[in-house]
Every structure is written in C-alpha cells, then in structure tokens.
Interface confidence: medium
C-alpha cells in the first residue's frame, strides 16, 4: 500500500475530465490536486464517477477546506451535495440566494432531507431574518416550509415577506403558527380594498380574533365553509347569528352539514334557538327560549 501513495508517472491530472473515471481510488487520491478539483467542481457532475470515486473527491475537498467549503465550491457541488452530512454543512457560510437555489434544485422533488434542513437553517440564521426573496425561494421548493417553523421562528418573518406566501403554503400550519402569521398578514395587506384584501387574508384567518371577524362580516365577503371551519373556536363563539350570516353570505347553508363539528357545534350551543331558527336551516342545540345566559368569564373579569 505504501508505494501506491505516489502518483504514477504521467498520471498527474491536468484537469478534471472523463479520463479520471479509469483511475483507481488511490490514483485519484494521489494524482488529483485538491485545488484543481475546487476550481473545476462544475465539471464533476457531468463525469460518471463511481460512488467510491466521489467519496475520494469529497475527501480531498474536506482536507483542503477543514473549516468548511467556500461558497464558490458549494455553488457547484451539484449532486455531490447529497454526499454531504449535516455536520459538513454546519461548517458552511452560505450567503448567496443563488447558491441556496442551486443546492435546493439538487433535492427538488424529494422530501426535505437532513442536509437540506441544515442548509436552510444555516442560510436563514446567516441572513438574520426570513426576507421575502428567501421565503419565495423556500416555499417554491417546499410549500410546507413555513408551517415547519416554530412560532418563535415565524416571529422573525417580516410582514413584507407575507406577500410571497401562497394559500397552499399554509395548509399544514396549526393555530399557534397562524396566530403569529395573521397579524403580519393584516399589516402586509392593510392598504388593499375590501374584496382584494379578503382574497389575500383568507388563508391566514385561522389566526384572526373575534373583532376582525366581526369587521369582515360587515364587508359582504361571502366566506366559504372550508375557511370558516378553520377559524379559531374562541374567535367564532362570540359572533351573533346575524354576524355569521353576513360573514358566510350564500354559504351559510353549509352550516347544517357541519353542525356536529367544531367550531360550528360549539357556536350553536352559544346561540339562542330563536335566532338559529331565523336561518331556516333546522340547526338544533341552541339555548331554549326563556333561558337566561350568564357570561361567567365576564363576571370573573369584573370581580
């Protein structure tokens, strides 16, 4: 094995090309200069190296850059990125959105790998906040990205970035996440007129408080049942029958099909049966006529 460490005469690589696929692992190790490899990384992907040969090339880069690869190399890793461990990636300082895009392309169509999760984490931390361009890029590759963040992480999203969010990006968000995102969306879309505003804010309404729902009910928005069913129960309960009717418009008829599900079920229990009857939908379970409703939460607050 010892004599194999020197590069055989005439085998020293002058450039990264297809002739290298015929090199044994030890020849690659001995005959390919790591600095040459680093400057010609963009060629590697188009050469049919075996997995073992790629391991050698990665090893050479690791030796050349023990503190982490420079961005000029990272940007051209191509599918060699799949060979990187999260530990490798934690050493990187990726600042260019182009580099991030290049590496996300490699993983496109596949679920988010630990490598990609680490890369995104490093990139976002390096930027200090989830700016619009970054969010645009990440949600384009991973529609569920936003909902994978904790409420704390979401708090660093500036309102301006909300413009990049599509309804499908919020599909897997839970109420705690929408609680954080809704005020940002409200701020982002505040200068839009009524109908345009509703179209944009609709997917964030799972974080809306009662007073905002009341305000929307005055704007003839015709909220669909799917959106209504995603509203916070505590925000829906104080709404009157008249307000819900105005909020849903022609979609109010859909309440019947959802009367056993939250938040509709809980809301029905809080309404007077007389008021529910005015909808003509046959909703049952309201407070019978003649009963006095005491709001104990209000009473506790006063005492």
């Amino acid at each position: 094995e010892v004599e194999k460490t020197a590069c055989p005469s005439g085998k020293k690589a002058r450039e990264i090309d297809e002739s290298l696929i015929f090199y044994k692992k030890w020849e690659l190790e001995a005959c390919v200069d790591a600095a040459l490899l680093a400057t010609q990384m963009d060629r590697v992907n188009a050469i049919p190296f075996t997995y073992e040969q790629l391991d050698v090339l990665k090893h050479k880069l690791d030796e050349l850059y023990p503190q982490g690869y420079p961005e000029s190399v990272i940007q051209h890793l191509g599918y060699l990125f799949l060979k990187m461990s999260p530990e490798d990636i934690r050493k990187w300082n990726v600042t260019s959105l182009e580099t991030l895009k290049a590496l996300l392309e490699v993983n496109k169509g596949h679920e988010m790998s630990p490598q990609v999760a680490t890369l995104i984490d490093r990139f976002v931390k390096g930027r200090g906040q989830l700016d619009k361009d970054t969010l645009d890029t990440l949600t384009a590759f991973y529609p569920g990205y936003l909902c994978s963040l904790s409420p704390e992480e979401l708090s660093s999203v500036p309102p301006s970035s909300i413009w990049a969010v599509r309804p499908q990006d919020l599909d897997t968000c839970d109420p705690r996440q929408l609680d954080v995102l809704y005020p940002k969306a409200r701020l982002a879309f505040q200068n839009m007129n009524g109908s345009e505003y509703f179209v944009k804010i609709q997917s964030f309404l799972g974080g809306a408080p009662t007073e905002d729902l009341k305000a929307l009910s005055q704007q003839n928005v015709s909220m669909d049942l799917a959106t209504f069913m995603k509203l916070r129960t505590d925000a829906v309960l104080p709404l009157t029958v008249a307000e819900v009717q105005k909020l849903l418009g022609p979609h109010v008829e859909g309440l019947k099909a959802e009367e056993r599900h939250r938040p509709v079920r809980d809301w029905i229990l809080r309404q007077r049966q007389d008021d529910l009857d005015t909808l003509g939908l046959g909703l049952q379970g309201g407070i019978p006529n003649g009963y006095l409703v005491l709001d104990l939460s209000m009473q506790e607050a006063l005492s």
């Epitope: 992907n45 188009a46 997995y51 073992e52 496109k108 169509g109």
Partner: antibody
C-alpha cells in the same frame, strides 16, 4: 413528485430498431444521470448505461455498446434509448431510472416484444 | 466486471420469522445497495450505502457487511415482504446486480 413516464409496450420486428422514451417530471432534469436497465421475463436486472442530460455524456455497459444509443431532449425533459438490430434476446422490460444514494425513481418500464 | 452472487436463490419464511439473505462480490466493494421487486412492478430501493434505510422503508429491514460479503435482514417477515431482492454495486463500471433472491411466504 418525481416521475418517469414510459410507454407501456412496443412490438417490433426482428432486425428493426426501436426508440424508447422516458419523460421526466418533478425535478430538475439536467442535474441527474439517467440510467437504463433491462429485465428479461423471469430474469434479473442488467444495467445498460447512463446519460447526463446537461452534457450529453454517456457511459455504457460494454455488453450493450453496439445495441443501445442513449440521447436526451432537454427541452421536453425526455430521455431516449434506441435499440438496434433487434432479436428475440432483446425482448424484455426496459426501465429508465434515477439511482442516487438515498433515493431512486424508476419508470414503469416499457415491454419490448420482438416478433415477426 | 464485479459479479454479485446472491444466496439462496429462493427461500420461504413464515410471518414473524427472521430472514437473512447474502450477496457475495467477486472483488471488494465499499458499498452495497439492495432493491425489492414485486411481480409486475418496478424495483424499489431499500438500503443504500450498505446499511442505511431508504425513505419509507420499514425499520424491520436492515443491511450490513463489508468488502466482499454483504447481507440483508428482515427482522420479522410480513406478507407484504414476499418479493425478489437484488443487491447492486456501484464501485466500478459496469454497475452490476445480483441474480436475485426470491422470498416467498410460507
């Protein structure tokens, strides 16, 4: 969702040629090597070769060098394999596939039947 | 080229039984890959880099080995595991597959 779409079957005459297609979607076509694999009825898998869509570089199994020609059309994200001078030995299912460390994607395969 | 020899060619196992099949390489390889193929379907990657489970593969599958000797183990056989299993190497060209081990349900 990464997908490789292949036509279900091709019936060809002995001595003729056939060009099999593999349409890729759901990923960046130019990044990954596209592989072609042969499987005769009731037999194992044989690697034919691979092509890099961006550069057009190819790497063939010596056994198939005079039988198969791999090409790509980047504009339609489609890989092709032309099989020439067909004989009954070439009757098989031909798969296109992406094989990469921790993931793989295979087409559904095209059944080529060589018969007069 | 590297020849991969799988054994046994055919085997059967009862549900819950432990199953082990082997793959022997004609010369040393660094990694082994394992595929599962059911009749009428395309192959599916089970194990990459000798011992890592591919996405969505049940944890009852495991791989091990080094050099010229590798194995695939199913800790507890299930009916859906009845299939043909192929080993594959990418240490040198051409890429080669083993002839397969057909696993039947007893």
């Amino acid at each position: 969702q990464v997908q490789l779409q292949q036509p279900g079957a091709e019936l060809v005459k002995p001595g003729a040629s056939v060009k099999l297609s593999c349409k890729a979607s759901g990923y960046t076509f130019t990044i990954y090597w596209m592989h072609w694999v042969k499987q005769r009825p009731g037999q194992g898998l044989e690697w034919i070769g691979m092509i890099h869509p961006n550069s057009g570089n190819t790497n063939y199994n010596e056994k198939f060098k005079s039988k198969a020609t791999l090409t790509v059309d980047k504009s339609s994200s489609t890989a092709y394999m032309q099989l020439s001078s067909l004989t009954s030995e070439d009757s098989a299912v031909y798969y296109c596939s992406l094989i990469h460390w921790y993931f793989d994607v295979w087409g559904t395969g095209t059944t080529v039947t060589v018969s007069s | 080229q590297i020849v991969l020899t799988q054994s046994p060619a055919i085997m059967s196992a009862s549900p819950g039984e432990k199953v082990t099949m082997t793959c022997s390489a004609s010369s040393s390889v660094s990694y082994m890959y394992w595929y599962q193929q059911k009749p009428g379907s395309s192959p599916r990657l089970l194990i990459y880099d000798t011992s890592n489970l591919a996405s969505g593969v049940p944890v009852r599958f495991s791989g091990s080995g080094s050099g010229t000797s590798y194995s695939l183990t199913i800790s507890r056989m299930e009916a859906e595991d009845a299939a043909t299993y192929y080993c594959q190497q990418w240490s040198s060209y051409p890429l080669t597959f083993g002839a397969g081990t057909k696993l039947e349900l007893k």
